[in-house]
Each structure stands twice: as C-alpha cells, then as structure tokens.
C-alpha cells in the first residue's frame, strides 16, 4: 500500500528545485508532466526518469516512477507524462487476478490435452481437451503425466487463464 510522502520527506535532490520549469495552473489544475505548487500559483514540471503525472491534476508532487522488479523487463522508460512500462520476462506471465508477481509458465499440457495458446507475458499456455475442445483450468498434473512442449520443468500448480 502506498505511503504518504510530502515534499519534506524527499531527499533534497528530489524536492521541487527553483530552476524547474513553471507555468500557471488552468482552472486550478496542472497539465500532464507537472504538479501544482503548495501555494497553488504555479505548475512545476516533473523530473524526467524520476517522477511523472499522466493527467490534469492538483497533486502537490509528481508520482514516483515504477522500477521494474527482477524477473521483469522494461518495455519503455518513465517519462514526465508516463510511468515505466514493465513486462514479465520470457517464459513467465502475470495474471490479472494475481498481478503481484510474474509466475512461471507451464511447460506442457496434461495427457489427453493439446496446446492451443502459447505462454505470453500476460497468460500461461492454454490447453484444451483433444476430444471436446474445452479449456483446462485445473491444476498442473504430476511431471510424468505432462506432455512437454518446451524444455524445462513444469511450473508450480496454477490455474490457466481464459
């Protein structure tokens, strides 16, 4: 959960410096890439690579840029108007229902099933029953029951998305 951070909490080099680009608020709000000064008179630019704001706002400070976790790759860097975009490394995925970490994709489908969808950064492999064509959403079977589709060991039990 987020913690409340004020200008006073920030290190001196992170605080709004006098030389930062300023403009005037419009209807009490500052444009993307800026935050409002404490007296409400100025819009102060965010610091490239350090913080950002994506919309018109009345924030007293810009939002901190996300740092990609280990196991993630940086798709695009943080700018003054857009946060860092991180993506799971190849062979791992992040489900919407459990987005806290990248999980290892399964290496194959259970016996009697065929793979119809590859591992992507946002989904595990997708398996369907050979006969019925229905999706599998159960747990990963034991290793000897797994039909391997790529090298490596099966991931820990998990549900398939989709």
């Amino acid at each position: 959960e987020s913690a409340l951070i004020t200008q006073q909490d920030l290190a001196p080099q992170q605080r709004a410096a006098p030389q930062q680009k300023r403009s005037s608020p419009s209807e009490g709000l500052c444009p993307p890439g800026h935050h409002i000064s404490e007296d409400g008179r100025d819009c102060i630019s965010c610091k490239y690579g350090q913080d950002y704001s994506t919309h018109w706002n009345d924030l007293l400070f810009c939002l901190r840029c996300t740092r990609c976790d280990s196991g993630e790759v940086e798709l695009s860097p943080c700018t003054t108007t857009r946060n860092t975009v991180c993506q799971c490394e190849e062979g791992t995925f992040r489900e919407e229902d459990s987005p806290e970490m990248c999980r290892k994709c399964r290496t194959g489908c259970p016996r009697g099933m065929v793979k119809v969808g590859d591992c992507t950064p946002w989904s595990d492999i997708e398996c369907v029953h050979k006969e019925s064509g229905t999706k599998h959403s159960g747990e990963v079977p034991a290793v000897e029951e797994t039909v391997t589709s790529s090298p490596g060991t099966p991931a820990s039990p998990c549900s398939l998305s989709g």
Partner: nanobody, 126 residues
C-alpha cells in the same frame, strides 16, 4: 467482499449540476486510491477522475477539467464527484472503482481497476 454503491444520478439540463456519491463496504477504502469512470451508450468505458488514498491530489480527464471535482471521505468510506456546467456529452452511466492492486499511487486505466459498482445514470438534456 468489496461492494461499491453509486447514487446521485438523474436527469439535468445543460449547465446544471449533480453530485454523485459512492459508498464502499471495504475496510481498505481509506488506504486505496479510488476512481470514477463513465460509459456512454455504444462507447467504451472511459476515465473521468481518480483521487489519491489520502485525498491529497487527484487526476482529471481533460474533458472534465475545471467542471468536475472529486473528493473522498475516508471516515465515511465514501467517494464523491461534484459535476457542474454539465453538457450533453456528459450523459453516461458513471461508475466508481477500486484498483485491483495496491502498488499504483493513482491508477487511471480501466484495466488497473478490479472492483466496480453497478453505476448510476446521468442524463443531460434540454
């Protein structure tokens, strides 16, 4: 279980005002950012405004800038959206939403939100 209940919608003339409320049943309301979205008939759900968990600072879509004001009462677990100078294009179902994960300071996209109310209809017409 997270429950969000919007109220305050209705029919209003152009230039009029409405105040929407969203009551939350979840105890983490006071530590979470919250957002308002809207969906007009035949269109995709779009971001309107979002407020920080501590209610110090908010985001606004450019289309509502200067006309709408978001606020949050953590003690009452209630989110508000004061809407003024309403226009025909503001006609939509308005939803309040809580994010699906707690590490984003101020989420502003539909996919970042996992808990949604049923919505309240706002109609602006002469």
């Amino acid at each position: 279980e997270v429950q969000l209940l919007e109220s305050g919608g209705g029919e209003v003339q152009p230039g009029g005002s409405l105040r929407l409320s969203c009551a939350a049943s979840v105890s983490t309301f006071g530590t979470s950012p919250v957002g308002w979205f809207r969906q007009a008939p035949g269109k995709e759900r779009e971001f309107v405004s979002a407020i920080r968990w501590d209610a110090v600072g908010a985001y606004y879509a450019e289309s509502v800038k200067g006309r709408f004001t978001i606020s949050k009462d953590n003690a009452k677990r209630t989110l508000y959206l004061q809407m003024s100078s309403l226009r025909a294009e503001d006609t939509a179902v308005y939803y309040c939403a809580l994010p699906r994960r707690g590490d984003s300071e101020l989420p502003s996209t539909v996919k970042e939100y996992g808990y949604w109310g049923q919505g309240t209809l706002v109609t602006v017409k002469p």
